[in-house]
Interface confidence: low
């Protein structure tokens, strides 16, 4: 409306004081904001209200610019001086003044509910008998939907520290700085941060894989809070090594060390299952022997079945866990023993028959010191430093000590072995990591299983 | 296990389009991120952008005008797309998988694209 | 951008000998962040060494890599008929994420 308009003395008398003085009336003039006629902002950020002067302003206009909340008299914000503005957005609201480009936009930082509001633009002269008043605009506050974003550069590695980055790119830099706080179970150091992100140094563990990490920002101008949360994707070499071992139909539960000596009957068909840990999962695979780095294998994955063991399957059998962050390999070692209808007689029979009896005498001696320890105690042995091992002479000439350590959820009654059990079956063995090239003597455990066939 | 395996069209006329597919097993493009890096004959290797395991994606500088890398995760493909091709093109595209701390742990086989009239 | 550059562009090494390849970055880049590869013609570049002196699954253990900020080095402590091979170090630490010019390790 381009028609002049009487403002109110009473609106009108504070800021134009020195026209009145002068004996003059203040006139007012109409003009229309540029763009939309409402504006949303998120809770704690900030929009700014776009303002041109009127085209029609004189070069030799000068004045200030005053920006009200609608029924106000008290202005949000302005370049004068001498006005005060409302305590509710001092500090937060800002006339942006460029006369010379005919700017008088308003800035709002900290966005607040209660700024949930029309406003509008004031220009007044203390030299000029008119000022200038624009259309109102409405600015909408919402409730903050944004969310931080958490990145990482490339892959989190067990025992390698990474810089983890929480932004808020959507936050604008003449806000409150916002309050970045980090929780996470892995260990963690600050880094630097900036108005919109905080870095976090995370040096993780293999037990804080799948483990949550979170960023929450606070918005203190606004006193707002949000947050995102990730599960931690860490990479980590195998630490240990399981195998399960199944002879025939049958399973029972063993805990073996390394290079651990199992004896199988000849003819008997087994499966050797490989299992690891690790992130991503270790490539498995198993070779006869021990191998060296370029090692063809004899099974490309965790299981290996020998269909019916014999001489040629007699030693060792080495399961290695590949992985990008180091590589754990564990061995067995097979041997076998004969059925005696399966040999000839003469000399090679007497072999067999002494090694036969020898085996069957030590077993017997093994099998009667676990039923006296099982009778002394009914709770699994959790340690093993009382136990007296009977020292036994491996395939190659190892000594390996075999300890009654592990028990199965249900131990067998103590009684006389028949004839239908006197077969011993073997499963899952875990292997703790072992250092690459620095072998340890280790103590191999066993326990008598019994299975109910 | 791990394998990665690019499939270009070769040859491409200058000006045109370049449109390199890798197929990706042995793991999920939404747990790892993928890199495409080429080596032009005689010359270094030279890092062209990434996808990242959200899907966002960063690019060289140089190419952020030509370049666009994109991905159909049930296919487990990623997709590269460099246009109005100039000879200096002319290189072995590789993809690879972001691995431990920013290595590309997992190469593909390469494949050679000429540009030429 | 991190300009990476790496010297000498060409090396010749007799069997057994020491080998030291360097690479320098114009700005500081984290150790974490940088990393060597190994290329032979014909192949595809393998991860070498990686977070400046960690050596990848099947790496021997006559390489080794030092340094921090913007000096970095890779040594091969006895020359082998099968390191002859193009080395590249590539830094991760800042976008866009660049690789040296190589060094080309010959048998003399």
């Known amino acids: 409306m381009q028609g002049a308009q009487e403002a109110s003395a009473s609106e009108m008398l504070p800021l134009l004081l020195p026209l009145l003085w002068a004996g003059a009336l203040a006139q007012e003039r109409r003009f229309q904001l540029e763009g939309p006629e409402s504006l949303t902002v998120q809770e704690g950020l900030c929009v700014l209200v776009p303002c041109r002067l009127p085209t029609t302003l004189p070069a030799s206009y000068y004045g200030y610019g005053y920006w009200f909340l609608e029924g106000a008299d008290v202005p949000v914000a302005t370049n004068d001086p001498d006005e005060e503005v409302q305590e509710e957005t001092r500090g937060r609201f800002h006339l942006l003044w460029d006369p010379r480009r005919k700017n008088c936009s308003l800035s709002i930082r900290d966005a607040r509910r209660r700024d949930n509001a029309a406003y509008f633009f004031r220009l007044k002269s203390k030299w000029m008998k008119y000022g200038y008043t624009s259309s109102k605009l409405s600015v909408r506050v919402m409730a903050l939907t944004h969310r931080p974003n958490i990145s990482i550069p490339g892959t989190l590695e067990s025992g390698h520290p990474s810089n983890l980055t929480c932004s808020v790119p959507w936050v604008c830099e003449q806000g409150t700085p916002p309050i970045f706080s980090w929780m996470s179970a892995a260990p963690t150091s600050l880094g630097p941060r900036t108005t919109q992100s905080s870095v976090l140094t995370i040096t993780p563990r293999p037990q804080d894989h799948s483990t949550n990490l979170t960023c929450q920002v606070t918005f203190p101008g606004a006193g707002v809070t949000m947050e995102r949360t990730i599960q931690l994707n860490v990479s980590y070499a195998p630490q240990k090594v399981a195998i399960s071992i199944f002879q025939g139909n049958s399973a029972a539960f063993k805990i073996l060390q390394n290079t651990s000596s199992l004896p199988v009957l000849e003819g008997q068909a087994l499966r050797l299952l490989c299992d690891a840990d690790g992130n991503p999962p270790a490539h498995l695979s198993w070779f006869q022997g021990f191998p060296a780095l370029n090692a063809t294998p004899i099974s490309n994955t965790g299981v290996l079945e020998l269909p019916q063991v014999g001489s040629a399957e007699e030693g060792d059998f080495t399961c290695r866990a590949q992985h990008p962050l180091g590589s754990l390999q564990i061995s067995l070692s097979l041997f076998v023993h004969w059925k005696p209808e399966g040999r000839a007689g003469g000399v090679l029979g007497a072999v067999w028959g002494a090694s036969i009896t020898t085996l069957v005498f030590l077993c017997v001696c093994f099998i009667f010191r676990v039923k006296t320890r099982r009778k002394k105690a009914a709770q699994p042995v959790q340690n093993t430093d009382d136990v007296n091992p009977v020292m036994v002479s491996g395939s190659r000439g190892h000594q390996h000590q075999f300890q009654t350590g592990i028990v199965s959820d249900h131990p067998a009654e103590a009684g006389p072995i028949s004839e239908d059990e006197q077969e011993l079956h073997y499963a899952v063995l875990h292997f703790h990591k072992v250092q690459p090239q620095e072998p340890k003597v280790t103590d191999t455990e066993y326990s008598e299983i019994k299975i109910h066939k | 296990q791990v394998q990665l395996k690019e499939s270009g069209p070769g040859l491409v006329a200058p000006s045109q389009s370049l449109s390199i597919t890798c197929t990706v097993s042995?793991?999920?493009?939404?747990?790892?991120?993928v890199s495409w890096v080429r080596k032009p004959p005689g010359k270094g290797l030279e890092w062209l952008g990434v996808?990242?395991?959200?899907?966002?994606?960063s690019y060289h500088s140089t190419l952020i005008s030509r370049l666009n890398i994109s991905r159909d995760n049930s296919k487990s493909q990623v997709f590269l797309k460099l246009n109005s091709l100039q000879t200096d093109d002319t290189a072995t595209y590789y993809c690879?998988?972001?691995?431990?701390?920013?290595?590309?742990?997992?190469w593909g086989q390469g494949t050679l694209v000429t540009v030429s009239a | 951008q991190i300009v990476v550059t790496q010297s000498p562009a060409i090396m010749s090494a007799s069997l057994g000998e020491r080998v030291t390849m360097t690479c320098t970055a114009s700005?500081?880049?984290?150790?974490?962040?940088l990393h060597w590869y190994q290329q032979k013609p014909g192949s595809s570049p393998k991860l070498w060494i990686y977070?400046?002196?960690i050596l990848a699954s099947g790496v021997p253990a006559r390489f080794s890599g030092s340094g921090s900020g913007t000096s970095y080095s890779l040594t091969v402590s006895s020359m082998e008929a099968e390191d002859a091979a193009t080395y590249y170090c590539?830094?991760?630490?800042?976008?866009?994420?660049?690789f040296g010019g190589g060094s080309k390790l010959e048998i003399r």
């Open positions: 690879a998988s972001d691995g431990y701390s920013g290595t590309f742990a997992y």
């Open positions: 042995g793991f999920s493009l939404t747990s790892y991120g």
């Open positions: 996808i990242w395991h959200d899907g966002s994606t």
């Open positions: 700005s500081s880049v984290s150790s974490s962040y």
């Open positions: 977070s400046t002196s």
């Open positions: 590539h830094q991760y630490h800042r976008s866009p994420y660049t």
